[in-house]
C-alpha cells in the first residue's frame, strides 16, 4: 500500500472512530434496564454519562440530568474524564493530521515535517482510542459488579407493613453506547497505528541526501557511501531510487512536487 493511501486510510478510519467516540459519550444508553427474569415494569429505564432516562409504555420519554458533581460515583466521573480526554486528543489529532496529509500542500512544508506530524497525530489517535476503550471498559465493569450485587438482593426489605413491603431493584445491563464506544475506540486506535506506519514511509532517507553524482565520460554512474551494499541493493534501503543530475531525489520526492493530479 502506498504511503499516501495508508496515511489517508488511517485518517479516515480515525475520523470515523473519533465520531463514534463523540456519539458514545453523548448517548443516553450506556446502561439499560435488564428485562430478563425481572418483574415486568411498565417503564423502561436507561442511563448515560450525563443523564438518566425513563421511557413509559406510551413512548413518552423523560430524562433528568445529573445536576451534581459531588454526589456522583467516582467511577462515573473517571469514565467521563477518560471520554473527554479521548475527544480532546482526537480533535488535536485530526487538526494535526489534516496538515500532515500528503495530498494537502501547505506552504513549503517538507516531508520530514509531515512525517513528524503524521507520527504525532497517530500517537494522539492511539491514546484517544485507548482512553475510549478504557472508559467504556471501566463502565462495563461497574455495571457487571452492580448487576450481580442487585441480583443477590433482587428484592430488598423496605420496612413498613410488617416488613413485608418490597421495592423493585432495577438491574442494569450493557447499553448500545458501550458497543459503540468499544468499536469507535478500536477504530481510532487502528487509524492511529496506520498513521504511525505511514509516517515511516514518509520519513526521508538520509542516504538520499548524502549521495553524490559523478559524471563519468560517456555515462552517468551514481556512487553512494556504503560500498558494495549500496549498489547491489542488499543494504538497508532496498527500494529502487533514481538519481538525477539535479541532485539526489527519490521517486517519493518527485511526487511531492505539485502535479495536475495532486489537487483532488
Amino acid at each position: 500500500m502506498s504511503v499516501t493511501a495508508c496515511q489517508g486510510l488511517g485518517f479516515v478510519v480515525s475520523l470515523i472512530g473519533f465520531a463514534g467516540i463523540i456519539a458514545a459519550t453523548c448517548m443516553d444508553q450506556w446502561s439499560t434496564q435488564d428485562l430478563y427474569n425481572n418483574p415486568v415494569t411498565a417503564v423502561f429505564n436507561y442511563q448515560g454519562l450525563w443523564r438518566s432516562c425513563v421511557r413509559e409504555s406510551s413512548g413518552f420519554t423523560e430524562c433528568r440530568g445529573y445536576f451534581t458533581l459531588l454526589g456522583l460515583p467516582a467511577m462515573l466521573q473517571a469514565v467521563r474524564a477518560l471520554m473527554i480526554v479521548g475527544i480532546v486528543l482526537g480533535v488535536i489529532g485530526i487538526l494535526v493530521s489534516i496538515f500532515a496529509l500528503k495530498c494537502i500542500r501547505i506552504g513549503s512544508m517538507d516531508d520530514s515535517a509531515k512525517a513528524k506530524m503524521t507520527l504525532t497525530s497517530g500517537i494522539l489517535f492511539i491514546i484517544s482510542g485507548i482512553c475510549a476503550i478504557i472508559g467504556v471498559s471501566v463502565f462495563a465493569n461497574m455495571l457487571v459488579t452492580n448487576f450481580w450485587m442487585s441480583t443477590a438482593n433482587m428484592y430488598s426489605g423496605m420496612g413498613g407493613m410488617g416488613g413485608m413491603v418490597q421495592t423493585v431493584q432495577t438491574r442494569y445491563t450493557f447499553g448500545a453506547a458501550l458497543f459503540v464506544g468499544w468499536v469507535a475506540g478500536g477504530l481510532t486506535l487502528i487509524g492511529g497505528v496506520m498513521m504511525c506506519i505511514a509516517c515511516r514511509g514518509l520519513t526521508p532517507d538520509d542516504s538520499n541526501f548524502k549521495a553524490v553524482s559523478y559524471h563519468a565520460s560517456g555515462q552517468n554512474v551514481a556512487y553512494r557511501p556504503g560500498g558494495f551494499k549500496a549498489s547491489t541493493g542488499f543494504g538497508s534501503n532496498t527500494r529502487n531510487k533514481k538519481i538525477y543530475d539535479g541532485g539526489a531525489r527519490t521517486e517519493d520526492d518527485e511526487q511531492s512536487h505539485p502535479t495536475k493530479y495532486d489537487y483532488v
Partner: antibody, heavy 119, light 113 residues
Framework: VVQLVESGGDFVQPGGSRKLSCAVS????????MHWVRQAPEKGLEWVAY????????YYADTVKGRFTVSRDNPKNSLFLHMTSLRSEDTAMYYC????????????WGQGTPLTVSS | DIVMTQSPSSLTVTAGEKVTMSCKSS????????????LTWYQQKPGQPPKLLIY???TRESGVPDRFTGSGSGTGFTLTISSVQAEDLAFYYC?????????FGLGTKLELR
C-alpha cells in the same frame, strides 16, 4: 372527540368462546397502547390485558393468561379480545381503554360491553 | 403481583367537608430513574365508566378540579378532596401502573350524609 365503542358481549355458556371488539375514533390509534379492563357486577375494577401500539408488548392478568388473547388491527382502528374456556367468574362489564401518554395512566374509557357466562 | 389496599372501604361525608382516602401498595411504586411514583387514581360514578383523576401519584389530569389532590410516595398514597361537592359522590380506585399485571385497589365509596 375520542371515542371507544365496545361490542360482542353476550350470554355465553361456561367453556365457550367469545370475541369482543372495540372500534376507536378521534385519535391516532396506531400510536397508543390499549387495555382491556373488566368489572364484575357490584365489584371493583380488574385489569385484564394490555397491547402496545406496535403489538411488541402484550401482557395479561394471571386470571386470564392462556385463555384470553388480545390483538389489534391498526389500519381498521380496532382492538380485540378473544376469550376461550370461559368461566362464570368472567361475567363482567368489559371496558376498552386507551393507555394515556403520561404516567402509564388509562385515560379514555369506552362505555363497556357486558358479558354473561352462565349455563 | 402487587396488592393494592384501599381504606376506608366507604366514607360518609357532608358537602364542603375535607375528605382523605388512603391507598397502600405491597411493593414500592417509586421509579428512581425519573423520581416518579407510578400510581393512578380514578373516579367512577354509578352507571358510568371510570374517569382518570390523577397520574404519577400527584399530577392532576387536565379538566380535573383542583380540589382533588394526590400525594404520597413509595408504598403509601393519599387522595384528598378539599371540599366535597355533591357531584363527587362516587367510587374512587387507585391503580398500580408500574409493574405488570397492573392492579387496582378494591375502591373507596364516597357517600353523602
Amino acid at each position: 372527540v375520542v371515542q371507544l365503542v365496545e361490542s360482542g358481549g353476550d350470554f355465553v355458556q361456561p367453556g365457550g368462546s367469545r370475541k369482543l371488539s372495540c372500534a376507536v375514533s378521534g385519535f391516532t390509534f396506531s400510536s397508543f397502547g390499549m387495555h382491556w379492563v373488566r368489572q364484575a357486577p357490584e365489584k371493583g375494577l380488574e385489569w385484564v390485558a394490555y397491547i402496545s401500539s406496535g403489538t411488541t408488548n402484550i401482557y395479561y392478568a394471571d386470571t386470564v393468561k392462556g385463555r384470553f388473547t388480545v390483538s389489534r388491527d391498526n389500519p381498521k382502528n380496532s382492538l380485540f379480545l378473544h376469550m376461550t374456556s370461559l368461566r362464570s367468574e368472567d361475567t363482567a362489564m368489559y371496558y376498552c381503554v386507551r393507555s394515556g401518554y403520561y404516567g402509564n395512566s388509562l385515560d379514555y374509557w369506552g362505555q363497556g360491553t357486558p358479558l354473561t357466562v352462565s349455563s | 403481583d402487587i396488592v393494592m389496599t384501599q381504606s376506608p372501604s366507604s366514607l360518609t361525608v357532608t358537602a364542603g367537608e375535607k375528605v382523605t382516602m388512603s391507598c397502600k401498595s405491597s411493593q414500592s411504586l417509586f421509579n428512581s430513574g425519573n423520581q416518579r411514583n407510578y400510581l393512578t387514581w380514578y373516579q367512577q360514578k354509578p352507571g358510568q365508566p371510570p374517569k382518570l383523576l390523577i397520574y404519577w401519584a400527584s399530577t392532576r389530569e387536565s379538566g380535573v378540579p383542583d380540589r382533588f389532590t394526590g400525594s404520597g410516595s413509595g408504598t403509601g398514597f393519599t387522595l384528598t378532596i378539599s371540599s366535597v361537592q355533591a357531584e363527587d359522590l362516587a367510587f374512587y380506585y387507585c391503580q398500580n401502573v408500574y409493574i405488570y399485571p397492573l392492579t387496582f385497589g378494591l375502591g373507596t365509596k364516597l357517600e353523602l350524609r
